[in-house]
Interface confidence: low
């Protein structure tokens, strides 16, 4: 099967945009050449991460491929098209009034994208309206070179934002994860994601989610009551993609949020998370920037214990070992801590109930000039059975009104050398962070100083 072309391809014309956006009137996605479609998939999944500068880890500890390197490599493989779903863009330092050498990797990425357009490779970007980066001109710069850009008015459509962070390259390769198109994501923020190479079935499934954003980026777009059949997914928690990843039997599927952006066959992101938690029998390890069993962006906030209850039920009802590692930075909302302490209070080793919560504090060091950085921004979970890599923080709004995606992967142990499954690799990364000196137990946190490194 192949992804049919969606019904409409108009280009959003933002008012007073200084660069020439008119290039965007042609289709953002051209079907791949038949020959390319017929190539046999040889799927490969690589975990990628960003470690903030000046955050040394113990020698010999496990690590993933550096995100910046992976992104540049992925662009090097591009031959026809690159589709990017992104919350916002801020790849250059002066976007945020910062002159810091650590922004150079972001600038290299912008340079690479400009070169890509020079090679007549189609670049289509679906980005959020509202956006965080009002001063960034990355997208105008790329549009001047021929990029197609659409702003998806999630604020108007669902009262949320487009919070997804994924790429589809040539309808074959994928990046998805916690990192925004932001130079800080490459050098100043702790991130985790996955790159999947040579996997057209999964890539073209994720492309359908990109296309849901794309069609909502035309003027006066409205959410369809029912999404047309060509947006439907063939892969979900009941019927995941089955394939060999580097020779290892693997199942995988993409989930999405909010429900309004889940066409037929697409597993909802919250449902995917709950399913992974529900199937765990030994452990659930999660690393998230924020954990709130409430709404975050509605006033007054509502209590929303769905994920909290699932973790409690797993620990209390099945004896599953639960570990939650939460981001802690200068911009962390301190009202989160009572919820974390409440969850940890359930722990009772004598009754075989194991719930541990730590915060991960990235020392600011001499990087205090860089706002909204030096934090663990990851959004992943791993059990003995599955790996979940997402784009959503853990509170209600991210699943009910905000656009995000998740990837659920399960690999068969025993079919390869020990330690090679994706879930085992992710567990090792989690345990590296959990046992590092930057992971601090809640007992060690004094109120009012919650997220300042005391090292």
């Amino acid at each position: 099967w192949q992804v049919p072309r969606p019904p409409t391809w108009g280009q959003v014309q933002p008012k007073d945009v200084p660069r020439s956006w008119e290039h965007g009137s042609s289709p953002a996605w051209e079907p791949l050449e038949a020959e390319a479609r017929q190539q046999r998939d040889s799927c490969q999944l690589v975990l990628v991460e960003s470690i903030p500068q000046d955050l040394p880890s113990a020698a010999g500890s496990p690590s993933a491929q550096p995100l910046g390197q992976a992104w540049l490599q992925l662009l090097d493989t591009a031959q026809e098209s690159v589709h990017v779903a992104s919350y916002y863009w801020s790849l250059t330092g002066p976007d945020i009034g910062v002159n810091d050498s650590s922004s150079q990797l972001g600038e290299a990425l912008l340079q690479k994208l400009q070169q890509l357009l020079g090679r007549n490779i189609s670049l289509a970007v679906a980005t959020s309206s509202p956006t965080l980066a009002r001063t960034s001109t990355d997208l105008q710069v790329l549009a001047a070179r021929g990029a197609h850009v659409r702003q998806v008015p999630m604020g108007r459509l669902t009262r949320g934002v487009l919070h997804s962070k994924f790429w589809v390259v040539d309808g074959r390769h994928i990046y998805m994860g916690s990192a925004n198109m932001d130079w800080r994501s490459l050098t100043q923020v702790k991130e985790l994601g996955a790159v999947i190479y040579n996997c057209s079935h999964l890539a073209q499934d994720l492309e359908k989610t990109f296309q849901t954003y794309w069609v909502l980026g035309v003027p006066k777009a409205v959410l369809p009551k029912t999404w047309p059949q060509n947006f439907s997914s063939h892969f979900n928690r009941f019927q995941p993609f089955h394939g060999l990843f580097d020779g290892v039997p693997t199942t995988a599927y993409f989930s999405a949020s909010p429900p309004a952006l889940c066409p037929q066959g697409r597993t909802r992101d919250l449902e995917a998370l709950l399913a992974v938690m529900g199937s765990a029998q030994e452990f659930i390890y999660a690393s998230v920037m924020e954990y709130f069993p409430t709404t975050r962006f509605s006033h007054p906030p509502r209590y929303w214990p769905v994920l909290d209850n699932a973790l409690r039920a797993a620990a209390f009802g099945k004896g599953v070992r639960v570990r939650l590692l939460v981001g802690c930075g200068l911009n962390t909302d301190p009202t989160m801590f009572p919820y974390l302490r409440s969850l940890q209070a359930l722990s009772n080793p004598a009754a075989n109930v194991s719930v541990d919560v730590k915060v991960f504090i990235v020392p600011v060091g001499n990087h205090s000039n860089i706002p909204f950085s030096r934090v663990n921004h990851s959004k992943f979970m791993v059990t003995e059975k599955a790996a979940y890599i997402g784009t959503s923080n853990w509170s209600e709004d991210y699943f009910s009104s905000t656009a995000g995606v998740g990837l659920v992967v399960t690999q068969s142990p025993g079919a390869q050398p020990a330690g090679a499954t994706v879930q085992e690799q992710l567990r090792q990364l989690f345990e590296r962070d959990w046992s590092s000196r930057y992971a601090v137990g809640l007992d060690g946190q004094a109120p009012g100083q919650d997220c300042v490194w005391q090292g």
């Epitope: 660069r19 002066p94 001109t137």
Partner: antibody
């Protein structure tokens, strides 16, 4: 190191055309835009257009669209600009410059001085 | 097209002086402002890109600042080798455009 070599001068007759070269070395020629810039005697700089050697993709300043044609020969890492229907207004120094970080022109040739005279 | 204006076409200063050259764009160019130095022999060099980024090999006495429509190049301690003409250029909207230049001379 990055170098852009241009011939020093061209003397041409009105109504004819001239094709000037810019030989690049010290970097991957196909990965960077090549800009062309005009400077009339005692005047400022005017951007003519640019070309991406990896695909022959071009952008032109509207003012020079019917005057200049940009091409490349990737086998010799050389960029060319042809100016047609020459008049005295075309007498100027023409620079090639590599498009580097964020479209800044980071390395420049020495310039080719074109004199249009009968 | 975006017009770039360098109001001072020539400037006299003494060696060791702090010199500031300004440049104004006809509309917001979002920091996509580059500065070039042209020596009397015609040689052109990039000094500053993206408002404030020093190009490799450029002495640290050169610095750039600005935002929106107004930008400036500062030479903190003028040296003889800095005697040249300085051009600003916007890289925000095609076609790229240059200012008319500011010729720096010694008193």
């Amino acid at each position: 190191q990055v170098q852009l070599q241009q011939p020093g001068a061209e003397l041409v007759k009105p109504g004819t055309s001239v094709k000037m070269s810019c030989k690049a070395s010290g970097y991957t020629f196909t990965s960077y835009w090549m800009h062309w810039v005009k400077q009339r005697p005692g005047q400022g700089l005017e951007w003519i257009g640019d070309i991406y050697p990896g695909s022959d993709s071009t952008n032109y300043n509207e003012k020079f669209k019917s005057k200049a044609t940009l091409t490349v020969d990737t086998s010799s890492s050389t960029a060319y600009m042809q100016l047609s229907s020459l008049t005295s207004e075309d007498s100027a120094v023409y620079y090639c410059a590599r498009g580097g970080w964020l479209d800044a022109m980071d390395y420049w040739g020495q310039g080719t001085s074109v004199t249009v005279s009968s | 097209d975006i017009q770039m204006t360098q109001t001072t076409s020539s400037l006299s200063a003494s060696l060791g002086d702090r010199v500031t050259i300004s440049c104004r764009a006809s509309q917001d160019i979002s920091n996509y402002l580059n500065w070039y130095q042209q020596k009397p022999d015609g040689t052109v060099k990039l000094l500053i890109y993206y408002t404030s980024r020093l190009h490799s090999g450029v002495p640290s006495r050169f610095s750039g600042s600005g935002s929106g429509t107004d930008y400036s190049l500062t030479i903190s301690n003028l040296e003889q080798e800095d005697i040249a003409t300085y051009f600003c250029q916007q890289g925000n909207t095609l076609p790229w455009t240059f200012g008319g230049g500011t010729k720096l001379e010694t008193k």
